[in-house]
């Protein structure tokens, strides 16, 4: 049964209706709507816009529009009892105190509910001590330390810059080093943009402004006390001592003014080079402890947080496919904010907002997709993508039998200079067409395609005329579909210019100042960057769920595979004699990849060919390249890492939002000359380069003839 | 439809105790705590405190601390206060609302339709 | 604990008139105040939450404002289902603490 034979429409006209539908005025709306006040995850606030997304959900036409809540670890700061930094004299007197709140912006001075700033998760505490300056607190950064410079970390606060790298990365790492604290801040020369105004005249960082955020090191394993199984009312919870990824030192988050206080103060060794100078007036001096003058000052940090279980709710809307219900494309995004969320998530939240609406009205006429969509209002991503993790443990054993594909929809934008797209190679063919099929909104791209605009501004590095499409990582909402389940997956947005923008992430991220404002009059006054995004994410939705042949291209995993084993060939290259010495061989690795992109190129042709009148031959083709990305998954999961299953892809080990290739050969290699047993170093890289090799293999023979 | 259903009128003698209850029904009774609020004859209204049956968390007034404790039965969707050392003052209705069990919330939405406890030698 | 001092304690007023009763707050309290309505045999009813929003159900007559410590709700046109006795209550901090009441009566 084709698909035509669930409405009297023509799949492209389908296609066409939907797009159509989709309207800037109404992402505008949704967004305003949203965005008034906080939605911080566990709070009445957020139940409520929960359901009232459940009853806007049921009013556009889905089928059914469901809460599912989960009890899961949260952190909030002790609301009579606030967390701040302060600089103490010989005496132990408060001589300096950090902000404990951000200035409100303008119009939001009466808003009750705005969280102070704090880092998610910290345990509570009040050290007190010299001050190290750790730059971004990256992997490189405590080895230039600790190796080059001779600096000891231990027994010390740290302060690092945010950007680079995932907080909570920086947080282990500071915790390694033997740090008995850390004070996070926001650097003008990382989110403070040159030539731009400061909030409410511009989009930059004002001094007062602080990011939140959580400081976990979950690897995917959801709720801290609950890790592989749902939060359900009868879940069994670890005690605090057994949770996952939790720090054990106190950390907290500043703005640039009170950093700037902090760091004019420190004396010790000069910054290594210019790479650890940020923008303010200060040395950059690395410590540890302040300058002569200063010397018997110290730092003292005041952290009161706490740890509460507590009741989440995603919204999690269905429209049944008329031809395979019991195939699933999901589409995601969290609902939860940190304070008004104008772009994280609300700018993606609206997005999905109106491509529901424009689903519910075709369904309103009559039309069905082939494949069940599932709609999902995430909660407590902030809080370590906890919602769509407890979902998907609750939901597993449904999902790796019939998820067909993830697609992720938090911020719509972070910049609005061009696409950004990350996902799955088997998504490659399918982002090309159809962006090939929409307009451009960029300037000077009229009557363009976006594909046009996006390959000119942001070129793939390997192919000419291409658009670059980057590995997934993780951060969002996608991790748990991804690399704990292997379902196929992507996300979409509109970004910045890299080149001439080097600061991290936007300036605004996961402050107070994240408002509506914000987007309508420094981002996106049309609205037509989150229209272009809303077709980019509907249209891909759209076309997983609805075409005949699911529109996945294998050949281009074939290339990827290449390219990924050429890569950690040559790393592992980098120590020809141990290679050597420890008869180390990455045959086995080529020649699956060889055999794989013959397999996938064979699978291709039989696709080009296959009778599709034929229901079960269809089904059959249409399995196998849904499966294919399962294929990928070993059950035993990482080293260490058990929730991360992805044998071709995972999150960096030294930065949680960066994807790896081949991880495990990666973090195998990784500082191999530095241990102590090469021997039983080398064997570790030996057995990874063998995982690797049998799961590319086995994946290619999913693809084979199956008879 | 969210309601909160109390048990009837009482009389105590000073120095008894009393048990009011409070039947929840209409939404999912461990998403949302209960609070306790008097109201003595002619008088405005006291907040004595709140239980959240989610966590087993009271959180009582100074004022009642010691003489008041709250309990709830989450197989059967009721929470209990118990006030004791009852003096003629406590006369009163004692009303039972329902509060969001979250670190914001927006206090008391719905509210039972109260208790009247009369102490009298 | 925060105090709340409302006025006036008592009103008459008609069919029609507008009506504003205010609450202040002896400490900031932000928007976490609700207005509550209890009819004469008792029944209690939320009319406003965190200042200014409107309960389900609640006809539009009524409306909720800030201005600085000060709370006011504002009945546009009373009608008669409207002869009660009002309250503010804080909920910034424990013990929550409630206005002494304005009691609406028929002029």
């Known amino acids: 049964k084709s698909s035509n034979e669930a409405t009297n429409i023509t799949p492209k006209h389908n296609m066409k209706a939907f797009l159509d539908e989709l309207k800037a005025e109404n992402i505008k709306k949704f967004l305003y709507n949203f965005t008034q006040i906080p939605h911080l995850a566990g709070t009445e606030q957020n139940f409520q816009l929960a359901k009232q997304i459940q009853s806007q959900w049921k009013e556009f036409g889905l089928d059914s529009v469901e809460l599912a809540h989960y009890d899961v670890l949260l952190s909030y700061p002790n609301k009579t009892h606030p967390n701040y930094i302060s600089i103490i004299n010989e005496d132990g007197n408060e001589i300096f105190n950090t902000s404990l709140f951000e200035p409100p912006p303008p119009g939001y001075e009466n808003v009750s509910d705005i969280v102070p700033p704090f880092s998610a998760f910290s345990p509570q505490g009040m050290p007190e001590g010299d001050l190290v300056y750790v730059n971004y607190a990256r992997t490189e950064d405590f080895f230039k330390l600790e190796r080059d410079m001779k600096i000891n970390c231990s027994g010390k606060i740290v302060i690092a810059r945010y950007g680079k790298v995932f907080r909570g990365n920086k947080v282990k790492n500071a915790q390694l080093a033997g740090a008995k604290g850390v004070i996070l801040y926001s650097d003008p020369a990382d989110y403070f943009a040159p030539g731009v105004k400061s909030y409410p005249d511009g989009w930059n960082l004002p001094g007062g402004g602080v990011q939140r955020g959580n400081i976990l090191n979950l690897n995917g394993a959801g709720d801290p006390l609950t890790p592989g199984y749902p939060a359900n009312e009868y879940a069994y919870r670890r005690g605090i001592a057994e949770a996952v990824g939790l720090p054990s030192i106190p950390v907290h988050p500043i703005g640039y003014y009170d950093a700037q206080k902090l760091l004019e103060k420190m004396g010790g060794s000069a910054p290594p080079d210019s790479s650890w100078r940020g923008s303010l007036k200060v040395p950059y001096n690395v410590g540890p402890g302040f300058t002569g003058n200063f010397s018997t000052q110290k730092v003292k940090m005041h952290i009161h947080s706490t740890n509460e279980v507590t009741r989440i709710y995603n919204v999690i809307g269905t429209l049944r496919g008329a031809v395979e219900p019991d195939r699933y494309v999901i589409l995601g995004g969290h609902r939860d904010s940190w304070v008004f969320g104008g772009i994280d998530p609300q700018s993606g939240a609206a997005v999905v907002h109106e491509i529901v609406r424009s689903f519910g009205t075709l369904k309103k006429e009559g039309w069905r997709p082939r494949r069940t969509i599932l709609f999902a209002s995430w909660d407590a991503e902030e809080f370590g993508l906890l919602g769509s993790t407890e979902w998907a443990e609750e939901n597993s054993r449904l999902l790796q039998e019939r998820g067909v594909a993830y697609i992720n929809a938090d911020s719509s934008i972070e910049g609005n200079y061009t696409l950004r797209v990350d996902c799955t190679p088997l998504m490659y063919s399918l982002v090309h067409n159809l962006t090939k099929e929409l307009k451009s909104p960029d300037e000077g791209f009229e009557g363009k395609s976006l594909y046009e605009s996006w390959t000119k501004k942001s070129p793939s590095p390997e192919f000419s005329g291409m658009p670059r499409i980057s590995k997934l990582g993780s951060g969002n909402d996608f991790e748990v579909f991804f690399q704990r389940l292997g379902i196929a997956s992507g996300r979409a947005r509109y970004t910045k210019n890299w080149e001439t923008n080097k600061f991290s992430g936007y300036p605004l991220y996961h402050s107070v100042y994240e408002t509506y404002e914000l987007v309508e009059k420094f981002y996106d006054p049309m609205f037509k960057y989150h229209l272009t995004v809303a077709q980019v994410r509907g249209g891909m939705v759209f076309e997983l769920a609805n075409s005949i042949v699911l529109p996945f291209d294998c050949r281009d995993y074939a290339v990827v595979l290449r390219k990924y084993a050429d890569k950690i060939y040559s790393i592992s290259m980098k120590h020809p004699q141990e290679m050597k010495t420890y008869s180390v061989s990455f045959d086995s690795l080529f020649s699956a990849v060889k055999n794989f992109t013959e397999i996938a190129s064979k699978f291709s042709e039989r696709l080009q060919d296959f009778d599709k009148s034929n229901p079960i031959v269809l089904r059959m083709m249409n399995d196998q390249l849904m499966f294919l990305e399962r294929a990928f998954i070993d059950p035993l999961g990482l080293p260490d890492r058990p929730f991360y299953r992805h044998v071709i892809y995972a999150p960096s080990s030294h930065n949680k939002y960066a994807g790896e290739s081949f991880p495990g050969i990666y973090d195998a290699l990784f500082d191999i000359e530095s241990k102590v047993d090469p021997s039983k170093a080398w064997g570790e890289v030996k057995r990874q380069i063998y995982v690797a090799a049998f799961t590319v293999q086995a994946a290619a023979e999913t693809l084979s003839e199956v008879a | 439809e969210v309601q909160l259903v109390q048990s009837g009128a009482e009389v105590k003698k000073p120095g008894a105790s009393v048990k009011v209850s409070c039947k929840a029904s209409g939404y999912t009774f461990t998403s949302y705590g209960i609070s306790w609020v008097r109201q003595a004859p002619g008088q405005g209204l006291e907040w004595m405190g709140e239980i959240f049956p989610r966590r087993g968390n009271t959180y009582y007034n100074e004022k009642f601390r010691g003489r008041v404790t709250m309990t709830t039965d989450k197989s059967t969707s009721t929470a209990y206060m118990e006030l004791r050392s009852l003096r003629s003052d406590d006369t009163a209705v004692y009303y039972c609302?329902?509060?969001?069990?979250?670190?914001?919330?927006?206090?008391?939405?719905?509210w039972g339709q109260g208790t009247t406890v009369t102490v009298s030698s | 604990d925060i105090q709340m001092t409302q006025s006036p304690s008592s009103l008459s007023a008609s069919v029609g008139d507008r009506v504003t009763i205010t609450c202040r707050a002896s400490?900031?309290?932000?928007?976490?105040l609700n207005w509550l309505q209890q009819k004469p045999g008792g029944a209690i009813k939320r009319l406003i939450y965190a200042t200014s929003s409107l309960d389900s159900g609640v006809p539009s007559r009524f409306s909720g404002s800030r201005s600085g410590s000060d709370y006011t709700l504002t009945i546009s046109s009373l009608q008669p289902e409207d002869f009660a006795t009002y309250y503010c209550l804080q909920y910034a901090s424990s013990p929550y603490t409630f206005g002494g009441g304005t009691k609406v009566e028929i002029k």
């Open positions: 609302a329902r509060v969001f069990d979250g670190y914001y919330n927006y206090a008391m939405d719905y």
């Open positions: 400490q900031d309290i932000g928007s976490s």
